[in-house]
């Protein structure tokens, strides 16, 4: 981009240096070079000389016209051909930007991940603006009317210690850039309604060789929330559709969930929880794979294991993967 250059003249853009993408724009260059009546004025975009749509306005000024300008950023500079000068003389340069005004932020969501000490607010920013867009998150107590504002370029983490106006708040988001400003609808929250329990994790699986073989999935969470509802979904890795089991859970001990599965098939499991009756779910846990044996018992440990199988009676393989899938719509 154009940084520090000594100008011998002036370059400007109409309608503005930052403009709406797809507009027709004019770039003007006016020379003010001592002892130089420019024979010709040249325009460069990103270092490449422009050859068309240049109009000489008067002895010192020229105009470059662009129709339907679609580049998000460009560095422009202009030069003059001066008599008795072998090289072109730099007049001035300017960085120009095109983009869009922000959309109205929607789907404003605030959650408190248990133990985080923060309220995390996110929103759908809408279409890409291409230009610097800032967001101001407003948090206003419904009782004290104390309003706090947080400037960010994406989501925001707000310390719950700073929320001193009780438990009931309005939250809304203002989006602003050089081309416009929009404001979201107001979200009314109660701090206790937006807590998401500490992540539930599947630790191991075992298949017990009974008359009808049964697979036990062991899973746990460090949550202190008493009433927690969870869902475990599972499917054969070759399948598209998930089966879902629901549980009312008390995490004072490790959970054991029983499944009657087909033999010699690789399954994938995920779990997620929410405080019973509340709005927001955890994202689905990491993928946990378990292959049911043909006949012999099988134990699998840790989430997202390697595909390591041997001929022994018990197989355990460990990997530290954090792959999650299909998290869309889990919060909201």
């Amino acid at each position: 981009g154009i940084t520090n250059i000594n100008c011998s003249g002036h370059i400007w853009v109409e309608p503005a240096t930052i403009f709406k993408m797809g507009m027709n724009i004019s770039i003007y260059c006016q020379a003010a070079i001592k002892n130089c009546q420019p024979r010709k004025l040249h325009f460069y975009k990103n270092g490449i000389k422009e050859r068309f749509q240049i109009t000489r306005i008067n002895k010192t000024t020229a105009r470059l016209w662009y129709k339907n300008f679609l580049e998000p950023h460009a560095s422009m500079y202009c030069t003059a051909e001066c008599p008795k000068h072998f090289q072109e003389t730099l007049i001035c340069g300017k960085d120009i930007s095109s983009g869009y005004p922000p959309d109205i932020p929607d789907e404003v969501t605030c959650v408190i991940y248990e133990y985080s000490g923060n309220m995390t607010c996110t929103w759908n920013a809408g279409k890409l603006t291409y230009i610097d867009t800032k967001y101001v998150v407003h948090v206003k107590s419904l009782e004290t009317e104390e309003e706090q504002q947080y400037l960010t370029s994406s989501y925001i983490n707000i310390s719950t210690d700073s929320l001193q106006g009780g438990k009931k708040y309005l939250v809304w988001v203002q989006a602003a850039n050089a081309l416009g400003m929009e404001e979201s609808k107001q979200l009314q929250i109660h701090l206790d309604d937006i807590v998401i329990p500490s992540a539930a994790v599947i630790s191991r699986a075992e298949t017990i060789n009974a008359t009808v073989p049964k697979t036990i999935i062991y899973w746990d969470s460090q949550t202190t929330i008493e009433k927690v509802s969870c869902e475990m979904r599972y499917k054969a890795t070759t399948n598209q559709t998930w089966n879902v089991k629901e549980f009312d859970t008390n995490f004072t001990y490790v959970q054991q969930s029983e499944f009657y599965l087909e033999p010699n098939i690789k399954y994938v499991f995920q779990v997620r929880c929410q405080e019973t009756g509340k709005r927001y779910w955890q994202p689905w846990s990491s993928l946990f794979f378990h292959k049911t044996p043909e006949t012999v018992p099988q134990v699998t440990s840790k989430a997202f294991q390697h595909d390591t199988w041997n001929s022994g009676l018990t197989v355990a393989s460990i990997s530290t993967g954090h792959l999650t899938s299909d998290n869309r719509g889990d919060i909201g």
Partner: antibody
Framework: EVQLQQSGGGLVKPGGSLKLSCAAS????????MSWVRQTPEKRLEWVAG????????YYPDNVKGRFTISRDNARNTLYLQMSSLRSEDTAMYYC????????????WGQGTTLTVSS | DIQMTQSPKFLLVSAGDRVTITCKAS??????VAWYQQKPGQSPRLLIY???NRYTGVPDRFTGSGYGTDFTFTISTVQAEDLAVYFC?????????FGAGTKLEMK
């Protein structure tokens, strides 16, 4: 010392109107949400109106909505309850109370003022 | 509206007794419950906020507990000056509601 001094109670005929006042002192009135709570002759407590610190957010239960209006004058440190279309069931002792938002509770109460609705 | 069902309505006690009053909310109110004491001819006085927090100056014989829908208020050792009516109140919704009250009387 926090004080809530109430005035304005009395005897009113059914369908009549009355305005209660609550003068606050000893704290920054404009920083606190306020409420009106009444106590029926049977000694039940009923919350009848609430207002946020700046007066932007106002709440009423259904049984008084459209008949009662809570307001405040932060310059005068005073809370008001304008009551109209009064009914016999509005007969009660009315209290103003300060809401301590970070406690989710009413921590200071006025001395109460009596409204009797009777023909 | 959220209903707060308080029980019992009356309690006959002797000095030194342990007293427990319960309040059940018609839906979860988190821990947004307060307990008040009202003596004859006086305004209500805040004792407990956020279900279990003792208000400034309240003796430690008064305790509260609970979360969600079930709440308990306890006086560990009743004294003569504790004879009063006790009310629970939820502040979870924007429309607060009170329990019907429990009257403590001496045997």
């Amino acid at each position: 010392e926090v004080q809530l001094q109430q005035s304005g109670g009395g005897l009113v005929k059914p369908g009549g109107s009355l305005k209660l006042s609550c003068a606050a002192s000893g704290f920054t009135f404009s920083s606190y949400a306020m409420s009106w709570v009444r106590q029926t002759p049977e000694k039940r407590l009923e919350w009848v109106a609430g207002i946020s610190s700046g007066g932007s957010y106002i709440y009423y239960p259904d049984n008084v909505k459209g008949r009662f209006t809570i307001s405040r004058d932060n310059a005068r440190n005073t809370l008001y309850l304008q009551m109209s279309s009064l009914r016999s069931e509005d007969t009660a002792m009315y209290y103003c109370a300060r809401k301590k938002s970070d406690y989710g509770a009413m921590d200071y109460w006025g001395q109460g003022t009596t409204l009797t609705v009777s023909s | 509206d959220i209903q707060m069902t308080q029980s019992p309505k009356f309690l006959l006690v002797s000095a030194g007794d342990r007293v427990t009053i319960t309040c059940k909310a018609s839906q979860s109110v988190s821990n947004d419950v307060a307990w008040y004491q009202q003596k004859p001819g006086q305004s209500p006085r805040l004792l407990i906020y956020y279900a279990s927090n003792r208000y400034t100056g309240v003796p430690d014989r008064f305790t509260g507990s609970g979360y969600g829908t079930d709440f308990t208020f306890t006086i560990s050792t009743v004294q003569a000056e504790d004879l009063a009516v006790y009310f629970c109140q939820q502040d979870y919704s924007s429309l607060p509601t009170f329990g019907a009250g429990t009257k403590l009387e001496m045997k």
